[in-house]
Interface confidence: medium
């Protein structure tokens, strides 16, 4: 069964969804879809990354935490009640089935009041999860073949970014991770 | 250290296909991206596109589709750019520069530049 | 692609000046800008990456902030050496664009 997030309309709603790059310069495929994750790819696609960066989004749906490190959660703009409903984020991991996939369903709640657009997220739900950073090894290398090889400052250097970055916030909201490799 | 050399200037007619390269050192070539900017006279910066010469991955410029090739040459560490049907606005300082050690998005470092003048 | 609206296109400075640019995206590019720094006739130089880490060796007077569509590029104190242009550059989606440059003059 789908997570469910809530949001009120006029806020930002944020769909959370997480994976663990091999290494930061070769991403794995990502694509946003309305409704529930079909067989294959995403279905009334809203935004898709590449290898390396956002190559399609629709207004009002954006990236906002750092995707190049595998934070691909979901922003939507200022919501309404149209706005509701499932929401796909499928990690598009190469190789014959091998994508994940998570549903995230959205409630949107009418405003109390007319509220001013906030950037404030409504959980509702939490699931444990696990984000590591590590290094560039012959697992990756199956997995996603040609990367960049990352040595052990690379490695701390990133570890650092991590915690400093917006991303170690998200780590203590609810979401959904999958470790690559 | 990083040193990313370029190739001299050029002088083209309009029509005529330019190709630059930028000869890499001091690091591993295959590690990292490769952009190639581009600045006319008093102008911007204009991004052209990029390669990634482990797997010879590329993305173009919309804007350049058709006219621009990016390759590499893994064996000198040198990445190559074409561009063909050359305009006069196409005047411009042509930069090789490398996808960052700390982001592979932006670029720690830059070729000199390679002058190409379109005139007939 | 995304329109990077770079103010203000001069900027009149003296030795010492606390000064800001800044850069607005077309739309939300989260903290992928980068600011570099280019003196005539020399190749850019990058100053700051995702928005606010300042690159290796770059002197801590040079800070940027911001993140989404707003970002903001400061020079604590100017130093001589420190008249040039600076661009900002968003790297969320190709095509990479970058603004029209903001040019440090002696008042």
């Known amino acids: 069964s789908e997570v469910e997030y809530r949001a009120e309309v006029g806020q930002n709603a944020y769909l959370p969804c997480f994976y663990t790059p091999a290494a930061p310069g070769n991403l794995v495929p990502v694509c946003w879809g309305k409704g529930a994750c079909p067989v294959f790819e995403c279905g009334n696609v809203v935004l898709r990354t590449d290898e390396r960066d956002v190559n399609y989004w629709t207004s009002r749906y954006w990236l906002n935490g750092d995707f190049r490190k595998g934070d691909v959660s979901l922003t939507i703009e200022n919501v309404t009640l149209a706005d509701s409903g499932i929401y796909c984020c499928r990690i598009q991991i190469p190789g014959i089935m091998n994508d994940e996939k998570f549903n995230l369903k959205l409630v949107i709640k009418p405003a109390k009041v007319t509220p001013a657009p906030t950037r404030q997220r409504d959980f509702t739900a939490a699931f444990p999860r696990m984000l590591t950073t590590r290094g560039h090894g012959p697992a990756e290398t199956q997995t996603l073949g040609s990367l960049p090889d990352i040595n052990l400052t690379q490695i701390s250097t990133l570890a650092n970014e991590l915690r400093d970055s917006r991303l170690a916030n998200d780590l203590r909201d609810s979401g959904a991770t999958i470790r690559i490799g | 250290q990083v040193q990313l050399v370029q190739s001299g200037a050029e002088v083209k007619k309009p029509g005529a296909s330019v190709k630059v390269s930028c000869k890499a050192s001091?690091?591993?070539?295959?590690?990292?991206?490769m952009d190639w900017v581009r600045q006319a006279p008093g102008q911007g910066l204009e991004w052209l596109g990029y390669?990634?010469?482990?797997?010879?991955?590329?993305s173009y410029n919309q804007k350049f589709k058709g006219r621009v090739t990016m390759t590499t040459d893994k064996s000198t560490s040198t990445a190559y750019m074409e561009l063909r049907s050359l305009r006069s606005d196409d005047t411009a300082v042509y930069y090789c520069?490398?996808?960052?050690?700390?982001?592979?998005?932006?670029?720690?470092?830059w070729g000199q530049g390679t002058t190409v003048t379109v005139s007939s | 692609s995304i329109v990077m609206t770079q103010t203000p296109k001069f900027l009149p400075v003296s030795a010492g000046d606390r000064v800001t640019m800044t850069c607005k995206a077309s739309q939300s590019v989260g903290n992928n800008v980068a600011w570099y720094q280019q003196k005539p006739g020399q190749s850019p130089k990058l100053l700051i990456y995702?928005?606010?880490n300042r690159y290796t060796g770059v002197p801590d007077r040079f800070t940027g902030s911001g993140s989404g569509t707003d970002f903001t590029f400061t020079i604590s104190s100017v130093q001589v050496e420190d008249l040039a242009v600076y661009f900002c550059q968003q790297h969320y989606s190709s095509p990479y664009t970058f603004g029209t440059g903001t040019k440090l003059e002696i008042k």
């Open positions: 995702y928005a606010s």
């Open positions: 001091g690091y591993t070539f295959t590690d990292y991206y």
């Open positions: 520069a490398r996808g960052g050690y700390y982001s592979y998005y932006s670029y720690d470092y």
């Open positions: 390669i990634y010469p482990n797997n010879a991955g590329t």
